[in-house]
């Protein structure tokens, strides 16, 4: 099972001589989960050349990948705490079939996609405690992210790895919203 | 490599509006986890933050300034603009652009422009 | 706000010794604590991130300690070029804050 970072990940932050606060460990937590998104992208760039293809829009079309909007309330204009973290859950929630995809894709880096999955549900499972309003996250439903998943592994090589190569810069990106707008918290 | 430069008035009369420019170069504003901010340093004082811009056009204002500032940016242009109305002498300073964040949207500024001393006079 | 305290403000010092600079924090601020190089008649410039992470390019003759609310900048062996004023930055939460500088002189 993943370490907490910032116990063990030598590469995020110093030692500490105090105890990190519940804010200071998901922070921790979310930059060990993007070094690990970090060395699977380089895997996929070295790989294909798919980080500097412009038809990403043709295979953005099939997928729904969460992003954070100004209406989600992690923004500074307009920021609300409890919206904010229902849609940080809920898309995390909804990017786990994704990362669910992504663990055949890699040959030299296998065991970094385990990691990136598993420390994401501990990532979860964090937030769920923090959530004050858990009656309004919405859970996807098991069959729809069976068949979405069976439909992703069908694409072609091209489309497989243009797919990987979104998913992880989308995950990336929300990620690093989730941080902002935790550090507000 | 990567360069931030600014641009504007030399000098600024009382109540005036100032206008910025920051033109960036070696990375695109549009990087996730990236942004720029704008710092001042007065002659013989220490900085202040006073304001930045990220990725997704996501901003955050000095409160002690905010009702005084604005910030935007230009993708295709590569430049960040920042308006501080209402000036006044004590807002006489060397005005910096930096860039910030990174991979963990650090609360760091790792490049800085060579400033643009602003001095405000009537 | 998060105010940050350096000490001392100046500091004369003769090259090859040791020089080591304070930043206290208000408040607790885990490792987010950063220091910039600010040489004179130029823009300043990170020298440590997080307390004690080096930066690429830095000399290793500098290096920060520190955690929570006590923060040290130390350069190991001063050389000429290293006069200018130091700065610690808060970039744990808003508003971003500096401490006032330490201007360190070569003898």
């Known amino acids: 099972a993943p370490v907490l970072p910032g116990e063990d990940s030598k590469n995020v932050a110093a030692p500490h001589s105090q105890p990190l606060t519940s804010s200071e460990r998901i922070d921790k937590h979310i930059r060990y989960i993007l070094d690990g998104i970090s060395a699977l992208r380089k895997e996929t760039c070295n790989r294909s050349n798919m980080c500097e293809s412009s038809k990403e829009a043709l295979a953005e079309n099939n997928l729904n990948l969460p992003k954070m909007a100004e209406k989600d309330g992690c923004f500074q204009s307009g920021f609300n705490e409890d919206t904010c973290l229902v849609k940080i859950i809920t898309g995390l929630l909804e990017f786990e079939v994704y990362l669910e995809y992504l663990q055949n894709r890699f040959e030299s880096s296998e065991e970094q996609a385990r990691a990136v999955q598993m420390s994401t549900k501990v990532l979860i499972q964090f937030l769920q405690k923090k959530a004050k309003n858990l009656d309004a996250i919405t859970t996807p439903e098991p069959t729809t992210n069976a068949s979405l998943l069976t439909k992703l592994q069908a694409q072609n090589q091209w489309l497989q790895d243009m797919t990987t190569h979104l998913i992880l810069r989308s995950f990336k990106e929300f990620l690093q919203s989730n941080l902002r707008a935790l550090r507000q918290m | 490599q990567v360069t931030l430069k600014e641009s504007g008035p030399v000098l600024v009369k009382p109540t005036e509006t100032l206008t910025l420019t920051c033109t960036v170069s070696?990375?695109?504003?549009?990087?996730?986890?990236?942004?720029v901010g704008w710092i001042r340093q007065p002659p013989g004082k220490a900085l202040e933050w006073l304001a930045h811009?990220?990725?997704?056009?996501?901003?955050r204002y000095n409160s002690a300034l905010k009702s005084r500032l604005t910030i935007s940016k230009d993708t295709s242009k590569s430049q960040v603009v920042l308006t501080m109305t209402n000036m006044d002498p004590v807002d006489t300073a060397t005005y910096y652009c930096?860039?910030?964040?990174?991979?963990?949207?650090?609360?760091?500024?790792?490049?800085w422009g060579q400033g643009t001393l602003v001095t405000v006079s009537s | 706000e998060i105010v940050l305290t350096q000490s001392p403000d100046f500091q004369s010092v003769t090259p090859k010794e040791k020089v080591t600079i304070t930043c206290r924090a208000s408040?607790?601020?885990?490792?987010?604590l950063h220091w910039y190089q600010q040489k004179p008649d130029q823009s300043p410039k990170l020298l440590i991130k997080?307390?004690?992470q080096s930066i690429s390019g830095v000399p290793s003759r500098f290096s920060g300690s520190g955690s929570g609310t006590d923060f040290t900048l130390t350069i190991n062996s001063l050389e000429a070029e290293d006069a200018a004023t130091y700065y610690c930055?808060?970039?744990?939460?808003?508003?971003?804050?500096f401490g006032q500088g330490t201007k360190v002189e070569i003898k």
């Open positions: 930055q808060n970039g744990h939460s808003f508003p971003w804050t």
């Open positions: 811009i990220w990725w997704d056009d996501d901003k």
């Open positions: 070696g990375f695109s504003l549009s990087t996730s986890g990236m942004g």
């Open positions: 408040q607790s601020i885990s490792d987010y």
């Open positions: 997080y307390a004690s």
């Open positions: 930096a860039r910030i964040g990174g991979l963990y949207v650090d609360y760091l500024m790792d490049y």
